[in-house]
Every structure is written in structure tokens, then in C-alpha cells.
């Protein structure tokens, strides 16, 4: 062609896929008259015309730019819509008259990759591997022209390097033309890598400058042999019986050894193996004093059979032993004295406390209770209390009964009953004494007696109200060696008009149910008459 | 063309070890990772041992003790054994090719039968 | 170890249909996810990877989706040689597969 030595460089015109370039032809008036006007492109040293100009008027040629050309800028700028990879070429202009002149212009197309696919080794990496082992993929789709992979680790580019670190990278042809870059990081890791962030990144370009893409970060599983291993026990601190207790191998190798707990037989000094659970970890529950001794853990490598062992780790269970109260069954006459004597081994320091059983209230503080010139009211439960301090929840405790001799002594000396006449009434009737009194009623019912401790009875029964009943009362009776004591029951028959009792009574304790004797499925709430101050 | 074929005796008696062959042309074993998949009768598919480009192994842990998988990379060949055969190992193996840049197996053997039985 | 859920096991459709086979993971895989179809007698073909990206050759009517824990492979034509079973396949700790859906004919 006629001067093309001189020709300048080409213009450069950057546009992204999809998108329109506009072609604009840079002929100055004297190089051509732009209303007659060929368009060509050229690829691989071959121009093929795809574009004329007459008198203003664009026409396409046949082929692969037919539809997607047309004139714009009264002719000057070609618009090519729909741009594609394979559009990257040089397209020309050239002016017809007054002579032959043409215009360059060098098309360059672009196309950000996908975002970057990042694909760690899913079986994990050996540290004592003999060369680089795959660490991860990653993937660009869809790029214009080929990306740059730069893949790091902790924020730090990673570099090539010789037996270390290898970066291979391939691209693909799409049949769009656009580019698909897959790239794998091989490296030798160490045991630090474990916690090690790698990532991939993709630089590319587009008209408006140069852009990257960053993967998700990824940790790769790292393997390395066990160095260490030792014991943890769960709950920290001072173990007491009764706790949930779990003794536990561990290691610092990935994956871990298979795990063997062993505890010292205290007479033979031999280690023997205790029986884990699936997870290999020792459960005691609950825990006895007996499992206080000495522990190990031993991790066995299943590929190199190495066995390593761990320091020994001494268990204390905390407890405190049966408590112990002398004298075990104490009786005592009126006025006299009892000193109550505690006593309990521990694995720590003890602390006692006696209370009153039936109040709670707590009547010394130590091992020794005295009690002076006792009183009948003095007999009943006394409760004496081992604990350790330093231990919450870790005490025992011992009851002990104290039995005052003397006759029976009622509940109650009187007690008025509101009744209904055929109603089956439920009376009851409580004493106490020592020797432990028996219970008899003056009428004829279904009577039942049940001890309530070793000084106390009580007595239930179920009887009809009749005519008589009514005019007579109940009476209970309470005997024992060294005497005997009666309780009143009057029964007053519940007037229906009567909303609220006297005010001078007051709720009893016990209730009277209706039996097939009545006609009607009815309660009756006993009543009972103010205590009087001596129940003797 | 990538090609991976399966060998192995076809029937095994309980408690003997089971040696199987995959013989592999179209790649090298030294860029591709090779593994061993087993199917039952009627089953669906179990990985069960590869080895890496780089020759690293690596096992299902359910079957770890009583595996080895080895190769030989100037005949080509992946081997595995597995020792303790029971019935429950009757199965279709196969050998598969890991893709070079993914993890995932872009090309398998036809596989070979092996029965476990007296 | 990651479990993988395919639901249904078996399904029945006519030439022509639109097919979803699902893929559930017991924990996030992220995109670490093939699927592959099987035919009686045959190996195990690989048609999805990375979770969505079509395998060389592969007609475009199978394409995959999903993410984290669940996953999707769709037929958007059912063709007479697509009837077999396919299976998913997590990739990203250790390898499993599902256990299976069978395509039949209706």
C-alpha cells in the first residue's frame, strides 16, 4: 500500500465486552472527503472490507459485522455494537479521493473475570511430604484477556520458590473467546500453617484501569506428628463424690493418636488400662473416693506406631465418709443432760454444725452437742451436719432421735368437729411419748395407726355420724408404761343456713368426706376450738 | 487420550487380602492425583484411598488400618491392598482420576468386581 | 464427617421434562460440589463441578446451583439417554457422595 512505512501508530480505542465501540475515522478534510468512506478490518495481515461510505450513506458488507454496524457523527464514526474478544483487531479507514489516505484504529476489548473460585485440598497436606503437595485451586472464568493470579498466604504474596513453593497455571479458550485462568498452589507447609489464610487473587484490566478480584480465604488441613500429649480433667478445680468427672488424652499432633488412659493399681503399682468411652475419654460418674490415684495417657501413632506418654496426672476425689453420732439411740429423763459426740473422716478439713431437725435452726457449731436439764419438747430429731468448707455441696449428715421418757401427750386436748348427720367422718388423733404410745377411741370405726417418728403416732378413723355419735362425742386415748392422756372430739352438726362458723373457731386440720351413706358428693371441714396453753 | 484400567482377582476368600492394579495412560501420575471409589451391589459409591501428584497418601478413615496404596510411576500403575476381606467388601472398584485443577474426578476406570466369598 | 442428603431417591419422568435432583450437606461446603451420572454397568461420569460449572462435553441442558448446603442439579430437557443415577459429591473435607437418585422412565 502506498505509503504505509510513514503510517503513525494506531489509535487506540478500549471498550468492555457487550458494549459498543465507536470507530471514529481521523481523516482530516485534505486526506479525504468522509462521504466516501471504506471501512476494513484486519486480521492476520488481511483486510477484509466490512463498511462503506457514499454521500453520507453507510452500507454493511456480507459477513460477521452485517448487523452490527452503523454510521454515526454524520458519517465520521463507525459504531460497532455488541463488542467480542474476537473484535480485538485493527479496523482502518480510507478515504477515497482527492487520493487514497487511510486512518488506523487498534481495537482492544476487555472482560472482568468472574469472581475467583477458591478449592482447598479437601484430604489435607502432610508437613513431612517429600515435594510440594497441592494445597488449592482457584479459578477465573470468564476473562478478557488472561488474568494474573497472585495467590497469597497471611496477606503475603507468595513467590516461586524451589522445592517450596510452585504456582502452575493454565487458561482455556471459551467458545465465547473469553479466557478461563485455573491455577494450583503447591507448597511444602510447616505445623504454623495450620492457622495459615490463602487466598487467590485476580489482576485484570478494563478501560477504566487495572481491577483485582480476591477469593474467599481458605485454612488448608494440615497433618503433623504428635509431640506431646497430656490430660485434662473436667470439671478445674477440688473434685468432690457425686460429680460428673472426665479425663481426657490430648495432643498437639493433627490428626490425633488413638488414645489409652491407664490408672495406677495403688497395691500392685501397675498401670492398668481403664475402659473410654467412644470419644476415648474416662467418664466417672458419679465419682467415688476410689477413683482419687494416679493417671496417664498414652498416644499411639497408628502410621508410625510411635507411642508417646504423658506426664502423670494425680486425681483427687473429695469425701467425706459416713457421719457418726454417739450415742446412736439416746434416752434421757426429764432434767437431765445428753452431751451428742460427731465424728467423719474427710480428704480435707471438716467443719460440723448440729441442727434441730424439725425447725432447722442450728444449735452448735462443732462436733460436740450438749443438751441440759432436758425437757420433754427437747425429744425428737437432731441432725448433725460434716462438711468442707472449701468444697460447696461436698458434707454427709447423721440424724439421731433423742427420746425424753414420759406419758403420752396429745396434739390437742379438745377439738370441735362441724359435721352432716350420715356423713362417714375422718378423724385423727396424734400423741407423743417414750416409750412411743398406742392409740384407742371410744367408738366403734375403721381406726389405723401410723408412726410418725420414734416418739410420735398417729391415729386415723373413719366412722359414720349417727344420732348418737353426735350426743356422745369421740374421744382418742393415748397409753404407754408410763401413763395415759385423752383427746376430745365434739361434733356439731353444720347448720345450712349458716354461711361462717363461730369466731371463736378455727379451721381444723383434717377433712370429713361424704360416703354412699349421703345423698350427695359433699365435704365437711372439721372445726376445732381454740388450743388450750397445756396439752398435757 | 486419558484411559485408567482396573485389574484384580475378581473373587477373594474372607480374611485374605485383596490386591488390585490400576493401570493409567493419557497423563502422568506425577500431575494427576489417582483415587480408589468402591460400589456395592445395588449401593452407592465410597471413596476409599488416593494418592496425590505428589505422592502422599491418604485413607477413609473407616477402612485406615487395613489399607495401603502405593504406585509405581514408570509402569503407570496405582495399587491398592486392602487386608481382613469380609463379605461386606464385595463391590465394584474403581480407580479415578483427580482433575489438575479441582478436586474432583474428571475420568474413571470401567472398574473390576470383587467378590468376597468362601 | 460431612454427610450428603439426596432427595428423591428414585424419580419418574417422560422425555421432555424438567428435572431438579437436590443435594443437602450436613455443614457448609461452600461450592466444593460435583455431580456425576451413572449408568448400569458403567463408571461414574463427572457433568458438574465447583457446584455450577459444566464439565467439557457435557450437554448444556444439565446445570448445576447452590451453595453452603444445598444444591441443585437441573435437566431442563429430559433426553432418553439421560435415564440413570446420578450422585452429588462433596469436595471440600475428605470426599463423600450421596447415596443416589435413580432417573426411570415414566
Known amino acids: 500500500v502506498p505509503g504505509e512505512a510513514e503510517q503513525p501508530a494506531p489509535e487506540l480505542v478500549e471498550v468492555e465486552v457487550g458494549s459498543t465501540a465507536l470507530l471514529k475515522c481521523g481523516l482530516s478534510q485534505s486526506q479525504g472527503n468522509l462521504s466516501h468512506v471504506d471501512w476494513f478490518s484486519v486480521h492476520k495481515e488481511k483486510r477484509t472490507l466490512i463498511f462503506r461510505v457514499r454521500q453520507g450513506q453507510g452500507q454493511s458488507e456480507p459477513g460477521e459485522y452485517e448487523q452490527r454496524l452503523s454510521l454515526q457523527d454524520r458519517g465520521a464514526t463507525l459504531a460497532l455494537t455488541q463488542v467480542t474478544p474476537q473484535d480485538e483487531r485493527i479496523f482502518l479507514c480510507q478515504g477515497k479521493r482527492p487520493r487514497s489516505q487511510e486512518y488506523r484504529i487498534q481495537l482492544r476489548v476487555y472482560k472482568a473475570p468472574e469472581e475467583p473460585n477458591i478449592q482447598v485440598n479437601p484430604l489435607g497436606i502432610p508437613v513431612n511430604s517429600k515435594e510440594p503437595e497441592e494445597v488449592a485451586t482457584c479459578v477465573g472464568r470468564n476473562g478478557y484477556p488472561i488474568p494474573q493470579v497472585i495467590w497469597y498466604k497471611n496477606g503475603r504474596p507468595l513467590k516461586e520458590e524451589k522445592n517450596r513453593v510452585h504456582i502452575q497455571s493454565s487458561q482455556t479458550v471459551e467458545s465465547s473467546g473469553l479466557y478461563t485462568l485455573q491455577s494450583i498452589l503447591k507448597a511444602q507447609l510447616v505445623k504454623e500453617d495450620k492457622d495459615a489464610q490463602f487466598y487467590c487473587e485476580l489482576n485484570y484490566r478494563l478501560p477504566s484501569g487495572n481491577h483485582m478480584k480476591e477469593s474467599r480465604e481458605v485454612t488448608v488441613p494440615v497433618f503433623y506428628p504428635t509431640e506431646k500429649v497430656w490430660l485434662e480433667v473436667e470439671p478445674v478445680g477440688m473434685l468432690k463424690e457425686g460429680d460428673r468427672v472426665e479425663i481426657r488424652c490430648l495432643a498437639d499432633g493433627n490428626p490425633p493418636p488413638h488414645f489409652s488412659i491407664s490408672k495406677q493399681n495403688p497395691s500392685t503399682r501397675e498401670a492398668e488400662e481403664e475402659t473410654t468411652n467412644d470419644n476415648g475419654v474416662l467418664v466417672l460418674e458419679p465419682a467415688r473416693k476410689e477413683h482419687s490415684g494416679r493417671y496417664e495417657c498414652q498416644g499411639l501413632d497408628l502410621d508410625t506406631m510411635i507411642s508417646l506418654l504423658s506426664e502423670p496426672q494425680e486425681l483427687l476425689v473429695n469425701y467425706v465418709s459416713d457421719v457418726r453420732v454417739s450415742p446412736a439411740a439416746p434416752e434421757r429423763q426429764e432434767g437431765s443432760s445428753l452431751t451428742l459426740t460427731c465424728e467423719a473422716e474427710s480428704s480435707q478439713d471438716l467443719e460440723f454444725q448440729w441442727l434441730r431437725e424439725e425447725t432447722g435452726q442450728v444449735l452448735e457449731r462443732g462436733p460436740v452437742l450438749q443438751l441440759h436439764d432436758l425437757k420433754r419438747e427437747a425429744g425428737g430429731g437432731y441432725r448433725c451436719v460434716a462438711s468442707v468448707p472449701s468444697i460447696p455441696g461436698l458434707n454427709r449428715t447423721q440424724l439421731v432421735n433423742v427420746a425424753i421418757f414420759g406419758p403420752p401427750w396429745m396434739a390437742f386436748k379438745e377439738r370441735k368437729v362441724w359435721v352432716k348427720e350420715n356423713m362417714v367422718l375422718n378423724l385423727s388423733c396424734e400423741a407423743s411419748g417414750h416409750p412411743r404410745p398406742t392409740i384407742s377411741w371410744n367408738v366403734n370405726g375403721t381406726a389405723s395407726e401410723q408412726d410418725q417418728d420414734p416418739q410420735r403416732v398417729l391415729s386415723t378413723l373413719n366412722v359414720l355420724v349417727t344420732p348418737e355419735l353426735l350426743e356422745t362425742g369421740v374421744e382418742c386415748t393415748a397409753s404407754n408404761d408410763l401413763g395415759k392422756n385423752t383427746s376430745i372430739l365434739f361434733l356439731e352438726l353444720v347448720n345450712l343456713t349458716t354461711l361462717t362458723p363461730d369466731s371463736n373457731t378455727t379451721t381444723g386440720l383434717s377433712t370429713s368426706t361424704a360416703s354412699p351413706h349421703t345423698r350427695a358428693n359433699s365435704t365437711s371441714t372439721e372445726r376445732k376450738l381454740p388450743e388450750p396453753e397445756s396439752r398435757g | 487420550e486419558v484411559q485408567l484400567k482396573e485389574s484384580g482377582p475378581g473373587l477373594v476368600q474372607p480374611s485374605q487380602t485383596l490386591s488390585l492394579t490400576c493401570t493409567v495412560s493419557?497423563?502422568?501420575?506425577?500431575?494427576?492425583?489417582v483415587s480408589w471409589v468402591r460400589q456395592p451391589p445395588g449401593k452407592g459409591l465410597e471413596w476409599i484411598a488416593a494418592?496425590?501428584?505428589?505422592?502422599?497418601?491418604y485413607y477413609n478413615s473407616a477402612f485406615k488400618s487395613r489399607l495401603s496404596i502405593s504406585r509405581n510411576t514408570s509402569k503407570s500403575q496405582v495399587l491398592l491392598k486392602m487386608n481382613s476381606l469380609q463379605t461386606e467388601d464385595t463391590a465394584m472398584y474403581f480407580c479415578?482420576?483427580?482433575?489438575?485443577?479441582?478436586?474432583?474426578?474428571?475420568?474413571w476406570g470401567p472398574g473390576t468386581m470383587v467378590t468376597v466369598s468362601s | 464427617d460431612i454427610q450428603m442428603t439426596q432427595s428423591p431417591s428414585s424419580l419418574s419422568a417422560s422425555v421432555g421434562d424438567r428435572v431438579t435432583i437436590n443435594c443437602k450437606a450436613s455443614?457448609?461446603?461452600?461450592?466444593?460440589l460435583a455431580w456425576y451420572q451413572q449408568k448400569p454397568g458403567k463408571a461414574p461420569k463427572v457433568l458438574i463441578f465447583?457446584?455450577?460449572s459444566l464439565q467439557t462435553g457435557i450437554p448444556s441442558r444439565f446445570s448445576g446451583s447452590g451453595s453452603g448446603t444445598d444444591f441443585t442439579l437441573t435437566i431442563s430437557s429430559l433426553q432418553p439417554e439421560d435415564f440413570a443415577t446420578y450422585y452429588c459429591?462433596?469436595?471440600?473435607?475428605?470426599?463423600?457422595f450421596g447415596q443416589g437418585t435413580k432417573l426411570e422412565i415414566k
Open positions: 479415578a482420576r483427580r482433575y489438575g485443577y479441582g478436586w474432583y474426578f474428571d475420568f
Open positions: 493419557g497423563f502422568s501420575l506425577t500431575s494427576n492425583g
Open positions: 494418592i496425590s501428584s505428589g505422592g502422599t497418601t
Open positions: 455443614q457448609n461446603i461452600y461450592n466444593s
Open positions: 465447583n457446584a455450577n
Open positions: 459429591q462433596q469436595f471440600y473435607s475428605g470426599y463423600t
